[in-house]
């Protein structure tokens, strides 16, 4: 069964900067990745980035840089311009559309006790079958 993992980390150098890492574990080829915050894509979440393996990446504020890390994982850097950091309590969701499996989505957030710069383990959130 395919799985999606999500990992959120705070940057050690800039406490207002966060990075979301997502990956797809399973067979098939990835056709699109969508990253949203505040909830799953299409269920109240706000799109932060769209990554297509051949057409390229797009991102919108507060996302700063979306990129492919490997053929099956991506990263999204976020910059919080506000005085307080809303990212700390926010859920980030990554949806991977793959062929022929369909769409798989998982969500994660920054662990409450995580130290800046330390990678949080993948959050064990149930994987949602989108289709």
């Amino acid at each position: 069964t395919p799985e999606v993992w999500v990992q959120v980390q705070m940057e050690a150098t800039e406490l207002s900067s966060f990075t979301v890492h997502c990956g797809f574990l399973g067979p098939g080829s990835i056709s699109l990745v969508t990253v949203s915050w505040g909830g799953p894509d299409g269920a109240g979440g706000t799109k932060l980035a769209v990554l297509h393996p051949e057409l390229g990446t797009r991102q919108w504020a507060p996302a700063r840089q979306a990129r492919w890390e490997t053929q099956s994982s991506i990263s999204l850097a976020l910059e919080d311009s506000g005085a307080s950091s809303p990212f700390a309590n926010t859920t980030f969701c990554c949806k991977f559309a793959s062929f022929p499996e369909g769409s798989w989505e998982s969500c994660g957030s920054l662990p409450p006790s995580s130290d800046p710069g330390l990678s949080a383990p993948p959050t064990p959130v149930p994987i949602l079958r989108a289709d």
């Epitope: 706000t46 799109k47 932060l48 769209v50 297509h52 393996p53 051949e54 057409l55 390229g56 797009r58 919108w60 504020a61 507060p62 990129r67 492919w68 890390e69 490997t70 053929q71």
Partner: antibody, heavy 114, light 113 residues
Framework: EVQLQQSGPELVKPGASVKISCKAS????????MNWVRQSHGKSLEWIGD????????NYNQKFKGKATLTVGKSSSTAYMELRSLTSEDSAVYYC???????WGTGTTVTVSS | DIVMTQSPSSLSVSAGEKVTMSCKSS????????????LAWYQQKPGQPPKLLIY???TRESGVPDRFTGSGSGTDFTLTISSVQAEDLAVYYC?????????FGGGTKLEIK
């Protein structure tokens, strides 16, 4: 069929502003982002910016910051671009293009002349 | 910003001939993470908006004839039309799809003799 229908030609005076529209049909408007591109007469293409209806925070080409403002009307499936402080240099055809520039609008000709 | 340079600026060929046009970028368009090149080619016929022909440097958009082929990697890319048809009269643009702001080349105008 995905279609982007743009508003008609505009003749505006220098210093004025203009707001052009791009009505999308044939797909779920909030699923895809929208680009705006300028093509001056006989010249190449310049990307102005993009906006996702689901996010609302546009990205701008630095060259067009302060010149263009991108917005969306989700209920009407329409994207808008306002151009201000127009000069003759802004006379061009302006296109909207959805997603990864895979579907383009019909184009709106803006002529700035006194 | 990534600067895209196309050559030649124009060329004139007879129907049935093979045509190649070049596009060079000022920075690499290769993503090291997934080893994909983010370059697209567009065709703009007179009085029409541009049409996406090729993305990912070499993948043809649905419905595009197989006489159009994209190749190249890094900073050097080529669009080849194996056997030019009269309806291929157009300006061809390459585009950086690697990083903001998205930038286009100056275009290559293809004329049919």
């Amino acid at each position: 069929e995905v279609q982007l229908q743009q508003s008609g030609p505009e003749l505006v005076k220098p210093g004025a502003s203009v707001k052009i529209s791009c009505k999308a049909s044939g797909y779920t408007f909030t699923d895809y982002f929208m680009n705006w591109v300028r093509q001056s007469h006989g010249k190449s293409l310049e990307w102005i910016g993009d906006i996702h209806p689901n996010n609302g925070s546009p990205n701008y080409n630095q060259k067009f910051k302060g010149k263009a403002t991108l917005t969306v009307g989700k209920s009407s499936s329409t994207a808008y671009m306002e151009l201000r402080s127009l000069t003759s240099e802004d006379s061009a055809v302006y296109y909207c293009a959805t997603g990864y520039f895979d579907v383009w609008g019909t184009g709106t000709t803006v002529t700035v002349s006194s | 910003d990534i600067v895209m340079t196309q050559s030649p600026s124009s060329l004139s060929v007879s129907a049935g001939e093979k045509v190649t046009m070049s596009c060079k970028s000022s920075q690499s368009l290769l993503n090291s993470g997934n080893q994909k090149n983010y370059l697209a080619w567009y065709q703009q016929k007179p009085g029409q908006p541009p049409k996406l022909l090729i993305y990912g440097a070499s993948t043809r958009e649905s419905g595009v004839p197989d006489r159009f082929t994209g190749s190249g990697s890094g900073t050097d890319f080529t669009l080849t039309i194996s056997s030019v048809q009269a309806e291929d009269l157009a300006v061809y643009y390459c585009q950086n799809d690697h990083s903001y702001p998205w930038t286009f080349g100056g275009g290559t105008k293809l004329e049919i003799k």
